[in-house]
C-alpha cells in the first residue's frame, strides 16, 4: 500500500492506477479529469475589499464604493454582528475582539457611523457627528503572541516558544520551505516553493517545533498561488495553503498577525528572519536546529542601486539584511517570515529571492505582505 | 488527449484586422497559460504575447502593444488572438502554445498553426 | 529584452553522428531555458525545458546542459528525422527565442 501511494494514482470510475508523475501534468489521464484536480491553483487578485485595518491602534475603516473614498468607523451603535460581519468581509472565520479608542488629533479621514447591508459594512446614510467621539478598534483573530521575547543578537538557536506560526513545509517528507500560521486554516509561504511540485497530494506541514524531523505532519487541502506575470516573473511570490483540519491553538502553535494595510517600514527598522535553511551560500545542509537573526529594512532605492539589485526590487518586494552583509536568508528558508514586532509580531514580509547569501551589497529579497492583503482577504472569503 | 485546434487560414488587406481562435481540449483550460508565437515565411519564431484563461489577463511584446489583443470564451476552451492595423511584414504562420506550467515554462503543446497573408 | 543567439547558424552532420548546438543569453537566464525542434510545415515540439529536462516522450539522445547563459542541446547518434531547425527560448523574464539552428545532412 505505501509503495502504491508513493508511486500511484488511483483513478475512479473505472478503478485504474496511473503513474504519480502524470498528477497535475496537464493532461486528464483519469477519465473523469481528478489526477488534475488536486494541483496548485492561481487565484486572481479580484475586487478590493470594502474594510481595512490600519495601523492607529488597528481601527476599523470603510471604503465608500460610490466615491471611492475611505471613513474611519465610528463606535456609536457598533455592535458585535457589524464586528463579525467586518471580519467575514476579510475572509476570517473567528470570533472577533473590539474595543472604543478615542479619536486622536492626527485623524485624518472622515469618521461615520457604520450599518449593515447583505453581509457587508456601509456607511448610514443619515449619519450626523461621532457623538462617542471613539472610533472602532478591532481585532479579528488573537493572533501574534509569543512566550518567549528573542534577544538581540546575531544569528542564534531559535525556540518554537518565540516563533510557534513557524512551521516546515515538506515534500515527500523533505523540508522545501518554511511558513507562517496565519489562522487554523491557513498558512503563508512562498510560490516559488511549489514551481518543481504542483500536485497538492504529497505536500505537508509540520507545526510547533524548532526541530525539523520531529513534529507530526499535517495534511494540505489546497494550494493557492496569486496569478504569475512572465514579464514580472518575481512579482507575486506569495501563496496560501488550506490544511485539511484545523489547527489547535497552543504555546507551540500559533498565529502570527497579518501586517495592517499602511504599515510603512522606515530604513533601519528592526526585523527578524528565522529559518531551517542552508547555514552558508551554496553549502552542505538545511540546518535541522530553527535559527532566527535579527536584521533591518534595507532602503528600496539602496536595494535597486547599480552594484545591487539594479531596479528588480520591485514596490511589491522589500529588502532586508544588515549593511555589513553576514546575516540573510538563504535557501530553504523561502516562504518563511520577515516579522516585525508593535504590540504583536506582524508577518511583513515572506523569504522570496536573492543572490547569493549574506552578500553586503545584495541583501534578501522579500514578498511585501500589505502589498497582497486584498489577495489574502479574497482568497479566504471564497473559501469560508 | 491535449490538443490545440485553430481557425483556417486568412487573407488581409494592409490596414486590416484579423483574429484567429484556438480550441484547447483534454485539459484544465483555465489551469494553463496560452503563448502567441508567430514565424514569417523562412524567419524564425517570434513570441508574441501571452493571456491567463483563469484570469483573462494578458501580457504582450513591446513592438505588438497596442495592435494585438487576446482575448478568451472559458465555456468553449477557446483563446482568441486579434492584430490590428495589419501590414505586409505580419504576412506570417500564427501558432497558439501552452505554458507548461503556471510558473515560468516552456510551451509544451502548440496549435497546428494559422497562415495569415497581408496583401493589397 | 534579453537577446538569444545561436551558433551555428547551420550545422551539417552524418547520421550517426553527435551534434552540439549552443545558445548563449545575453543576461543570465537561471536554468529557464527551453528547446525546441522544427520541421519544415510543421508546428514546434518541446525536447528540453529548464535547460536539461526532457519533455514526455522525446528520446534519450537529446540532452540539454548549462545555465545562466550559456547553453547547449546534444544530439548524441543523429537519426534521420533529427534533420531540422532547432530554436532556444529563455523564459526568465518574459520570452524571447533564438534565431535557430539548421541542422542539415552532411
Known amino acids: 500500500k505505501v509503495i502504491l501511494d508513493k508511486y500511484y494514482f488511483l483513478c475512479g470510475q473505472p478503478l485504474h492506477f496511473i503513474p504519480r508523475k502524470q498528477l497535475c501534468d496537464g493532461e486528464l489521464d483519469c477519465p473523469l479529469g481528478e489526477d488534475e484536480e488536486h494541483c496548485v491553483k492561481s487565484f486572481p487578485e479580484g475586487p478590493a475589499v470594502a474594510v481595512r485595518l490600519s495601523k492607529d491602534r488597528s481601527t476599523l475603516q470603510v471604503l465608500d464604493s460610490a466615491t471611492g473614498n475611505w471613513f474611519s468607523a465610528c463606535f456609536d451603535n457598533f455592535t458585535e454582528a457589524l464586528a463579525e460581519t467586518a471580519c467575514r468581509q476579510m475572509g476570517y472565520s473567528s470570533k472577533p475582539t473590539f474595543r472604543a479608542v478615542e479619536i486622536g488629533p492626527d485623524q485624518d479621514l472622515d469618521v461615520v457611523e457604520i450599518t449593515e447591508n447583505s453581509q457587508e459594512l456601509r456607511m448610514r446614510n443619515s449619519s450626523g457627528p461621532c457623538l462617542s467621539g471613539s472610533l472602532v478598534s478591532l481585532h479579528c483573530l488573537a493572533c501574534g503572541k509569543s512566550l518567549k521575547t528573542p534577544r538581540v543578537v546575531g544569528v542564534e538557536e531559535a525556540s518554537v516558544d518565540s516563533w510557534p506560526w513557524q512551521v516546515s513545509i515538506q515534500y515527500d517528507k523533505q523540508h522545501v520551505c518554511g511558513g507562517s500560521i496565519l489562522d487554523p486554516h491557513w498558512v503563508l509561504t512562498a510560490a516559488h516553493c511549489f514551481r518543481k511540485h504542483t500536485d497538492v497530494f504529497n505536500w505537508k506541514v509540520r507545526a510547533g517545533s524548532d526541530k525539523l524531523g520531529s513534529f507530526p505532519s499535517l495534511a494540505v487541502a489546497k494550494i493557492i498561488i496569486i496569478e504569475f506575470n512572465p514579464m514580472y516573473p518575481k512579482d507575486n511570490d506569495i501563496a496560501l495553503m488550506k490544511l485539511q483540519f484545523p489547527l489547535t491553538f497552543s504555546g507551540t502553535v500559533r498565529p502570527i498577525c497579518l501586517p495592517f494595510f499602511d504599515e510603512e517600514l522606515t530604513p533601519a527598522t528592526p526585523l527578524w528572519i528565522i529559518g531551517w535553511g542552508f547555514t552558508k551560500q551554496n553549502g552542505g545542509k538545511m540546518s535541522d536546529i530553527l535559527l532566527q537573526a535579527s536584521v533591518q529594512v534595507i532602503d528600496s532605492t539602496r536595494c535597486n542601486a547599480d552594484d545591487a539589485y539594479q531596479g528588480e526590487v520591485t514596490e511589491k518586494m522589500m529588502c532586508a539584511g544588515i549593511p555589513e552583509g553576514g546575516v540573510d536568508t538563504c535557501q530553504g528558508d523561502s516562504g518563511g517570515p520577515l516579522m516585525y514586532q508593535s504590540d504583536q509580531w506582524h508577518v511583513v514580509g515572506i523569504v522570496s529571492w536573492g543572490y547569493g547569501c549574506g552578500g553586503p551589497s545584495t541583501p534578501g529579497v522579500y514578498t511585501k505582505v500589505s502589498a497582497y492583503l486584498n489577495w489574502i482577504y479574497n482568497v479566504w472569503k471564497a473559501e469560508l | 488527449q491535449v490538443q490545440l485546434v485553430q481557425s483556417g487560414a486568412e487573407v488581409k488587406k494592409p490596414g486590416a484586422s484579423v483574429k484567429v481562435s484556438c480550441k484547447a481540449s483534454?485539459?484544465?483550460?483555465?489551469?494553463?497559460?496560452m503563448h502567441w508565437v508567430r514565424q514569417a515565411p523562412g524567419q524564425g519564431l517570434e513570441w508574441m504575447g501571452w493571456?491567463?484563461?483563469?484570469?483573462?489577463?494578458?501580457g504582450y511584446a513591446q513592438n505588438l502593444q497596442g495592435r494585438v489583443t487576446m482575448t478568451r470564451d472559458t465555456s468553449t476552451s477557446t483563446v482568441y488572438m486579434e492584430l490590428s492595423s495589419l501590414r505586409s511584414e505580419d504576412t506570417a504562420v500564427y501558432y497558439c502554445?501552452?505554458?507548461?506550467?503556471?510558473?515560468?515554462?516552456?510551451?509544451?503543446?502548440w496549435g497546428q498553426g494559422t497562415t495569415v497573408t497581408v496583401s493589397s | 529584452e534579453i537577446v538569444m543567439t545561436q551558433s551555428p547558424a547551420t550545422l551539417s552532420v552524418s547520421p550517426g553522428e553527435r551534434a552540439t548546438l549552443s545558445c548563449r543569453a545575453s543576461?543570465?537566464?537561471?536554468?529557464?531555458l527551453a528547446w525546441y525542434q522544427q520541421k519544415p510545415g510543421q508546428a514546434p515540439r518541446l525536447l528540453i525545458y529548464?535547460?536539461?529536462t526532457r519533455a514526455t516522450g522525446i528520446p534519450a539522445r537529446f540532452s540539454g546542459s548549462g545555465s545562466g547563459t550559456e547553453f547547449t542541446l546534444t544530439i548524441s547518434s543523429l537519426q534521420s528525422e533529427d534533420f531540422a531547425v532547432y530554436y532556444c527560448?529563455?523564459?526568465?523574464?518574459?520570452?524571447?527565442f533564438g534565431p535557430g539552428t539548421k541542422v542539415d545532412i552532411k
Open positions: 543576461q543570465s537566464v537561471s536554468s529557464y
Open positions: 502554445a501552452r505554458g507548461r506550467t503556471w510558473f515560468r515554462s516552456g510551451m509544451d503543446v
Open positions: 529548464g535547460a536539461s
Open positions: 527560448q529563455q523564459y526568465d523574464i518574459s520570452v524571447t
Open positions: 493571456m491567463n484563461p483563469n484570469s483573462g489577463n494578458t
Open positions: 483534454g485539459y484544465t483550460f483555465t489551469n494553463y497559460y
